[in-house]
């Protein structure tokens, strides 16, 4: 079925929501004053070999649990990330965007990445897909 302008708009809005969530996480942790940043950087994330289509979001979905675990370290009294809620929201968006009709086997790059590199990769992906839709 060919995508309609309304379905394209919905996809764009979901991607923008995903982008904002990922940017919020990155801005929240990638602060040189963050006492836990160096220790958060010791955690490794798997990166997609290829990420150019919505189906490749499967690779992001599979890394959401490890992401939540690292984000549990990032909370403070004045900075409420609420990792479980945030990851749950991202998961819902990712499931809607990638669709559940086709099962896609994610292929990962050989090199692992830090949380900052991981987030930047998926931010770039979201921006790239949004730009093709607008």
């Amino acid at each position: 079925m060919a995508p309609t302008s309304s379905s394209t708009k919905k996809t764009q809005l979901q991607l923008e929501h995903l982008l904002l969530d990922l940017q919020m996480i990155l801005n929240g942790i990638n602060n040189y004053k963050n006492p836990k940043l160096t220790r958060m950087l010791t955690f490794k994330f798997y990166m997609p070999k290829k990420a150019t289509e919505l189906k490749h979001l499967q690779c992001l979905e599979e890394e959401l649990k490890p992401l939540e675990e690292v984000l549990n370290l990032a909370q403070s009294k004045n900075f409420h990330l609420r990792p479980r809620d945030l990851i749950s929201n991202i998961n819902v968006i990712v499931l809607e965007l990638k669709g559940s009709e086709t099962t896609f086997m994610c292929e990962y790059a050989d090199e692992t990445a830090t949380i900052v590199e991981f987030l930047n990769r998926w931010i770039t992906f979201s921006q790239s897909i949004i730009s093709t839709l607008t």
Epitope: K33, N34, P35, K36, T38, F43, K44, S76
Partner: antibody, heavy 121, light 111 residues
Framework: EVQLVQSGAEVKKPGESLKISCKGS????????IEWVRQMPGKGLEWMGV????????YYNEKFKGQVTISADKSISTAYLQWSSLKASDTAMYYC??????????????WGQGTTVTVSS | AIRLTQSPSSFSASTGDRVTITCKAS??????????MNWYQQKPGKAPKLLIY???NLESGVPSRFSGSGSGTDFTLTISSLQSEDFATYYC?????????FGGGTKVEIK
Amino acid sequence: EVQLVQSGAEVKKPGESLKISCKGSGYAFSNYLIEWVRQMPGKGLEWMGVINPGSGGTYYNEKFKGQVTISADKSISTAYLQWSSLKASDTAMYYCARWRGEGYYAYYDVWGQGTTVTVSS
Amino acid sequence: AIRLTQSPSSFSASTGDRVTITCKASQSVDYQGDSYMNWYQQKPGKAPKLLIYAASNLESGVPSRFSGSGSGTDFTLTISSLQSEDFATYYCQQSNEDPYTFGGGTKVEIK
């Protein structure tokens, strides 16, 4: 019971290599970072570095970078601290400790009993 | 690196005394409303033991006579009524910035 058990005391000569260990039990070893702390005779405590046993990722105090290597084998729940060429100034008590950083905390809640390293010709 | 200065470096006290140890940081150890300051007790030949974390939180199993307070650069460890098992060296530690640093220690001896 959550505990960290370190290897026994070592007496070495300058220039020799050494690898001391820290074995965790009573908890999911891969889920907590392990840090190493030095205490020279009659002195205070100095943080050396940290390892994530789950990923192998490390971070060192600049003072100890290139002087020691921190590693881990998660299959046997053990972290290591090693020297390729010991100096007399490496004589100290070395502690491993478990880092806790959930929420808005960051502290060491469990410590090993310490490993005494004596380097003398 | 953040320097932590403890005072006094040592002193003598009697069982039942109220003891106060201070720790002054060379810069603030607060981040977004939280104080990254911890206190440890070390007895001769033993590993340090956590007493207080995040400036004022009592570690599980630690007697309530121990308490911590402070924020920014000035912190205090208080023992409300010194017991015989409390004679030891006490260290403050900041975990706000790498490298984590410890104070020089305060040795509490029997008078």
